[in-house]
């Protein structure tokens, strides 16, 4: 399955000496049949490689069995003995190279692993004579040492040194988590993103950090506009406040009224919640009417009675809907100066006689005007 | 060469359950995401939901929220849509479809999809 | 969810044919908008990515503007292999939704 990798255990071998140029079993590389102890091996020196077998923690370590973390190996490195770059900026280029196929330096092994990176493992380094004519066996080992530890990932190298029975071996080795994987074990996944599925970067710890205007676990909840109010509205995209049904204003803090409500307004949507002193479903029945019209005259006392409707409590004398009509007018005999009484459906009226006018006759034509009256001099008056 | 290949279609009463899949090849399955993409007879295109295979998180379309569930099997490179409680209007040739992405686009876009398998929900 | 509202539904054309179809969001989606291009039977191919870059393979005949609400897909050149249906697709804000296609056919 391609599945791609959460880390990389990465070995960069530095030095290996095998001053005797000599397989582990005693017998020269070029397979004279002599061996050191007959004299040496100085014809043909080795064509030295590394295996490397990583896997699962051991604590006495055993060289066969699967290399349960991964595999690698170097292509031939040198002779008898050579010494390689130390790791470090050459190394890094390598890996990024390693991982889009590319050439990379000789000495270093690349294992990629899938799985949470235990922080416990055994390395098990081989360096081997490379036979054009033979596949590899025991018999072409020049050197096997093994490491069993624990290393977390970090771009820091760790230097091992192993003294083997015949070769010497300088080594360096590290974990790092690949691109979009973080954590001691590099098995948590973030990379970046700016779409439907979230809009955020990743931190040094592999948290989402949402990008402006985004929030939420996944970075998928817009921002809305500042002050609305997310009982009632709502956002899609940043910035935005677009009300529920039955909601309106800048802010979604405001319930639509009942439709056609004139004094009365709303604590829930489509209600109508009415003022005081109106009442009806539309708050458009004035419960006070006395208060807003005062329609009582003459001292007349004004009772709210159905809505839009009011009484008049009018005191002795007086009568009619806003006791406008005065009863029995002319018994106070109002009229001066001879004037008759005659009573109306407004009050009284007084018919004065020649010379006198007002409306209770009382206005002497002669002293106030320096005139004669015209006409009969008869006035009416509306009490 | 990139693949996606939809399996698990079929004849189903309303009310019944069936299983999609869609076997992925040819590139690092957990470095994209695979969504499911419907569309009915002669209709448009209707998104479905989506899964991020690297880390199980999916999303889903209203439609189907509570009936419809997507996985995935990042050790064999496959991408599953459970349905259930299907009703007629679930009738459609699904899609599976790979959608790629990088901050430094706004948006992203389907940029392979397998062949599609019909799903019939009729009694 | 944001609505995606594309014009004309159908449009007919003839070979050489500057044709151009446009896609209004219902709330802004800055750039997150990609085209598809769909025949009869098949699965759609992607053509335009992030409002305005060319897939890769897809001739440059095809190109997308736009953003905020407003986006164009235009094909400076129309060939036979063109004759199809056009869908636009929002990814900005989940769920991600299509416009409800435009079908380009032979004048």
């Known amino acids: 399955a391609d599945l791609g990798s959460m880390g990389y255990f990465e070995l960069q071998l530095s030095a290996l000496r095998n001053v005797n140029g000599e397989l582990l079993s005693g017998a020269c590389c070029d397979g004279d049949g002599r061996t050191t102890r007959a004299g040496g091996c100085g014809r043909d020196e080795c064509d030295t490689y590394v295996r490397v077998c990583l896997k699962e923690y051991q604590a006495k370590v055993t060289p066969t069995g699967p290399c349960s973390y991964g595999y690698g190996a170097t292509p031939v490195l040198g002779g008898n003995s050579f010494y390689l770059p130390p790791a470090g900026a050459a190394g890094d280029r390598a890996r990024a190279r390693s991982r889009t196929g590319g050439h990379q330096d000789p000495g270093l092994v690349v294992i990629p692993f899938q799985f949470a990176w235990p922080r416990s493992f055994t390395l098990i380094v081989e360096a081997w004579d490379w036979d054009n004519d033979t596949t590899p066996d025991e018999e072409l080992l020049i050197e096997r040492v093994s490491h069993a530890g624990m290393i977390n990932p970090e771009d820091r190298w760790k230097s091992l040194h192993f003294s083997g029975h015949v070769a010497h071996l300088e080594l360096q080795i590290r974990v790092r988590c690949d691109e979009n994987y973080y954590s001691a074990t590099c098995n948590k996944f973030c990379r970046p993103r700016n779409d439907f599925f979230g809009h955020y970067t990743c931190d040094q710890y592999g948290n989402k950090a949402c990008m402006d205007g985004w929030m939420g676990k996944e970075c998928k909840e817009a921002v809305c506009k500042q002050g609305c109010n997310l009982l009632h509205g709502g956002c899609t995209v940043p910035g935005e406040c677009r009300c529920s049904y039955g909601w309106q204003g800048k802010f979604c803090d405001e319930c639509v009224p009942y439709p056609g409500c004139v004094h009365g307004s709303c604590v829930e949507p489509w209600h109508c919640d009415c003022e005081t002193n109106w009442g009806g479903l539309l708050c458009d029945k004035d419960l006070n009417y006395c208060g807003s019209h005062h329609p009582c005259v003459n001292g007349g006392t004004c009772i709210n009675a159905e809505p839009d409707q009011y009484l008049c409590a009018c005191p002795d004398g007086y009568l009619g809907k806003n006791c406008e009509r005065a009863e029995h007018a002319c018994a106070s005999n109002p009229c001066a100066n001879g004037g008759s009484c005659h009573e109306v459906p407004s009050g009284f009226e007084c018919h004065c006689p020649s010379g006198w006018n007002g409306p209770t006759c009382a206005l002497d034509i002669d002293e106030e005007f320096g005139l004669v009256p015209r006409g009969s001099g008869h006035h009416h008056h509306h009490h | 060469e990139v693949q996606l290949v939809e399996s698990g279609g079929g004849l189903v009463q309303p009310g019944g359950s069936l299983r999609l899949s869609c076997a992925a090849s040819?590139?690092?399955?957990?470095?994209?995401?695979i969504h499911w993409v419907r569309q009915a007879p002669g209709k448009g295109l209707e998104w479905v939901g989506g899964?991020?295979?690297?880390?199980?998180?999916?999303d889903y379309a209203n439609s189907v929220k509570g009936r419809f569930t997507i996985s995935a099997d990042t050790s064999k490179n496959t991408a599953y849509l459970q349905m259930n409680s299907l009703r007629a209007e679930d009738t459609a040739v699904y899609y599976c479809?790979?959608?790629?992405?990088?901050?430094?686009?706004?948006?992203?876009?389907?940029?392979?999809w397998g062949q599609g398998t019909l799903v019939t929900v009729s009694s | 969810d944001i609505q995606m509202t594309q014009s004309p539904s159908s449009l007919s054309a003839s070979v050489g044919d500057r044709v151009t179809i446009t896609c209004r969001a219902s709330q802004d989606v800055s750039t997150a908008v990609a085209w598809y291009q769909q025949k009869p039977g098949k699965a759609p191919k992607l053509l335009i990515y992030s409002a305005s870059f060319l897939y890769s393979g897809v001739p440059s005949r095809f190109s997308g503007s736009g953003s905020g609400t407003d986006f164009t897909l235009t094909i400076s050149s129309l060939q036979p292999e063109d004759f199809a249906t056009y869908y636009c697709q929002q990814s900005f804000t989940a769920p991600p939704t299509f416009g409800q296609g435009t079908k380009v056919e032979i004048k």
């Open positions: 899964i991020s295979p690297a880390d199980g998180d999916t």
């Open positions: 040819g590139f690092t399955f957990t470095s994209y995401d």
């Open positions: 479809a790979r959608n790629d992405y990088d901050v430094r686009f706004v948006g992203s876009g389907m940029d392979y």
